[in-house]
């Protein structure tokens, strides 16, 4: 017999996780596991447990984490990796619309997202959207172009700005962005 | 809200001892890495002492201290203590108590500050000769 499914990995409630802030990464395998193993990749960390709860986070907790787990002396597959994220390590961007927040349907617009440091990657979020929009940029702005605007589009965006050095520490997020389709 | 709180740091003639105190709220204590690191304006922050719970409570002290110093926890009173003997000029520095999530796999890893999450304020201790 082959090895046993991987578990799932989740960050509760939001891998995104501002300074100082609680949250808790949850490993889940098949009911009656033996042990669990849940690692912080390239740092030589782990715990034997399948929940790791973290009163506050710092940037030394920032990172990548999978986790697998034990029956008998067979182990898993490793979960996919959970990229856990520090925000409000770094003062927060602006975010503007070009040419203005409010769009007909059909219509283009450019989301920018502006910082006065060097950082190189941009990330967008649509309040609601589990993944965002990721952008490297050799200047300081990133652009996001919305091309053929729907209704779906319609929303609160923020954005982050980061350093491809440090990939897990952003900045605070934008003020938000609200894009309004007529 | 995590806090580390250390005392029991002061002026102390050479040869004497010194005990510090580190105690530990807001986190998960008997499961937590506990750590004694020290700095010297100018330098980096170095390694002293780490106790881990891990196979009953695993020691580990800098080259620099051994068999003059010694750490020690209570788990019940969510305290990490560092017993300093032989004191000499040369351990006059801020020393901070420090806090893990996560045990060590790899040997080093406990003497690397970034393996390290949360940190006290510090209490300075200073030998005079």
């Known amino acids: 017999s082959g090895p046993l499914p991987k578990p799932s990995l989740q960050a509760l409630p939001s891998s995104l996780v501002p300074l100082e802030k609680p949250v808790t990464l949850r490993c889940q395998g098949p009911p009656g596991v033996d042990l669990y193993r849940l690692e912080k990749l390239s740092s030589s960390r782990y715990q034997d447990q399948a929940v790791l709860f973290i009163p506050a986070m710092k940037r030394s907790l920032a990172g990548r984490y999978r986790c697998s787990y034990q029956n008998g002396s067979l182990w898993s597959l490793p979960s996919d990796q959970l990229e856990l994220v520090a925000t409000g390590v770094f003062a927060k961007p602006s975010l503007s619309a070009q040419p203005g927040p409010a769009v007909s349907s059909g219509g283009d617009v450019t989301l920018q997202c502006q910082t006065r440091y060097g950082f190189d990657q941009f990330a967008l979020y649509k309040e609601g959207d589990p993944a965002p929009y990721k952008n490297p940029e050799r200047w300081y702005r990133a652009s996001f172009p919305i091309i053929t605007v729907t209704a779906a589009h319609s929303g609160t965006y923020r954005c982050y700005s980061f350093s491809s050095r440090d990939p897990y520490l952003w900045s605070a997020p934008s003020d938000p962005l609200e894009l309004v389709v007529t | 809200q995590v806090q580390l709180q250390e005392s029991g740091g002061g002026l102390v003639q050479a040869g004497g001892s010194l005990r510090l105190s580190c105690a530990a709220s807001?986190?998960?204590?008997?499961?937590?890495?506990m750590a004694w690191f020290r700095q010297v304006p100018g330098k980096e922050r170095e390694f002293v002492a780490v106790?881990?719970?891990?196979?009953?409570?695993?020691?580990d002290h800098a080259d620099s201290v051994k068999g003059r110093f010694l750490i020690s926890r209570d788990n019940a009173r969510h305290m990490v203590y560092l017993q300093m003997n032989s004191l000499n000029p040369e351990d006059t520095a801020v020393y901070y108590c420090?806090?893990?999530?996560?045990?060590?796999?790899?040997?080093?890893?406990?003497?690397?500050?970034?393996?390290?999450?949360?940190w006290g304020q510090g209490t300075q201790v200073t030998v005079s000769s």
């Open positions: 420090a806090s893990s999530l996560l045990y060590c796999s790899a040997s080093g890893c406990y003497a690397n500050r970034d393996s390290y999450d949360y």
């Open positions: 807001g986190v998960t204590f008997d499961s937590a890495a």
């Open positions: 106790i881990s719970t891990e196979s009953g409570g695993r020691t």
